[in-house]
């Protein structure tokens, strides 16, 4: 009774297409698969960034897999062939592992890379990234930003840098077509006459860094003697109403402060017969149904009403 064996995949490698962290893991079928012609072999692939505790595991019948990685660190991957039990009249047979690693040889010391990288997608329309130069770098150092997301055929360089004293400290991006809900990859590298500069890699999804405009058209109506309805409109722009969450700050007679979060553009407030004046401000953020994270907008302009005036209007109506 001969033991069934299978070889590992051949030519296993990690290929960097220049997409700033989106890599291809690819391989060839193992040698001597002739005995298993009627059988579709599978491959178990494990990969991770070096330093990560956990492996991502994929089982596929294809000869490649694509995923995003953090190029600030190295990447390690391993793969073996699986012969399903249907092919062996018994239990699953696994080959030994084939292994591959990939890393970008770092230039310069870590301190030379950009500091405090910050990216905001204003009103889901305009992406702006800013950074500070590395520690101890001279004024001859300049940084360049490159970006890629699925849909672009190559990484693009920023064409509209924000400069201070001739040094690039940020980038205003052009219109980014079909760029949300997918990984957005950025590399900021640098050049200097005096010393090599370390590159930095960043990955995020645009819908998670949106800072909306503040709500507009704040109004206030008295629904009944002790009920006041606050209303506002969604900010102008491409963000649909269903994607907003709001925070309201209400001040009664310069004393009581109420902060509350609501999911639509109205809020009904109970007041006492002592209330003379009512002021409120609202700010907006993209909610959990449209993103995993977000940035609060600035507060709207403060609007104040005399309760007596509101009551008169209500009685007139």
């Amino acid at each position: 009774d001969t033991e069934i064996k299978v070889n590992p995949p051949q030519d296993f490698e990690i290929v960097d297409p220049g997409y700033l962290g989106y890599l291809y893991l690819q391989w060839q079928p193992p040698l001597s698969l002739d005995n298993f012609k009627e059988c579709t072999v599978e491959y178990e692939l494990k990969y991770r960034n070096i330093g990560s505790e956990t492996w991502t595991t994929i089982i596929t019948k294809n000869l490649h897999y694509k995923d995003g990685f953090d190029l600030n660190k190295g990447i390690e991957a391993k793969i073996h062939t699986l012969l399903p039990w249907q092919c062996t009249n018994g239990s699953e047979v696994q080959s030994s592992w084939a292994e591959a690693t990939y890393w970008i040889s770092p230039q310069g010391i870590p301190e030379t890379k950009v500091q405090d990288m910050d990216c905001v997608y204003y009103n889901w329309q305009y992406l702006l990234c800013s950074w500070k130069p590395g520690i101890g770098v001279l004024l001859d150092t300049n940084y360049n930003l490159f970006y890629w997301y699925e849909g672009l055929d190559r990484a693009l360089q920023c064409v509209d840098y924000i400069k201070v004293d001739g040094q690039n400290i940020g980038c205003r991006f052009p219109y980014l077509e079909s760029s949300d809900y997918k990984d957005f990859y950025i590399c900021v590298n640098g050049s200097s006459e005096t010393k090599p500069i370390r590159s930095s890699y960043f990955t995020f999804q645009l819908q998670n860094i949106v800072k909306p405009l503040p709500p507009v058209c704040l109004t206030c109506t008295q629904e009944s003697l002790y009920e006041i309805k606050l209303k506002w409109s969604i900010p102008l722009g491409p963000i649909p109403a269903r994607c907003f969450v709001y925070e309201i700050e209400i001040r009664e007679d310069d004393t009581t402060l109420v902060t509350t979060t609501v999911e639509n553009e109205t809020y009904t407030l109970k007041i006492t017969n002592e209330t003379r004046q009512l002021c409120f401000v609202v700010r907006s953020k993209v909610n959990i149904y449209c993103s995993d994270d977000g940035i609060w907008s600035e507060w709207s302009d403060k609007q104040c009403w005399e309760v007596e005036e509101l009551l008169k209007k209500t009685l007139l109506l």
Epitope: Y24, N62, L63, K66, D153
Partner: nanobody
């Protein structure tokens, strides 16, 4: 089902050039990567160059700077332009494609028979 036909091999003097061609025919719905390998008898095959996903081009070993891989998607063909040839480039050059059959769902690897390249004075 899928045939790979190589041509362009032969005897060439050191410093000379050759252009290898590989035409793919048969029932293949998509070609995802195309490569040239070479093998010397008694040694393991080695990858020379490939055009992989996203038209990424990669060269291996001594092929860098001397060889150029290209493809013609309309003809389902891949080429290898070899310049500044050296005696150590002598080998059987085999074309490989990874693609999906019209009747299939998963990638398969297909090989040509190979074409002999001999570099000698």
């Amino acid at each position: 089902q899928v045939q790979l036909q190589e041509s362009g091999g032969g005897l060439v003097q050191p410093g000379g050039s050759l252009r290898l061609s590989c035409e793919v025919s048969g029932s293949i719905s998509s070609i995802n990567r195309m490569a040239w390998y070479r093998q010397v008898p008694g040694k393991e095959r080695e990858m020379v160059a490939q055009i992989t996903y996203g038209d990424t081009i990669k060269y291996y070993g001594s092929a860098k700077g001397r060889f150029t891989i290209s493809k013609d998607s309309a003809k389902n063909a891949v080429y290898l332009q070899m310049n500044s040839l050296k005696p150590e480039d002598t080998a059987v050059y085999r074309c490989n494609i990874v693609g999906v059959l019209t009747t299939g769902h998963y990638e398969n690897s297909f090989w040509g028979q190979g074409t002999q390249v001999t570099v000698s004075s």
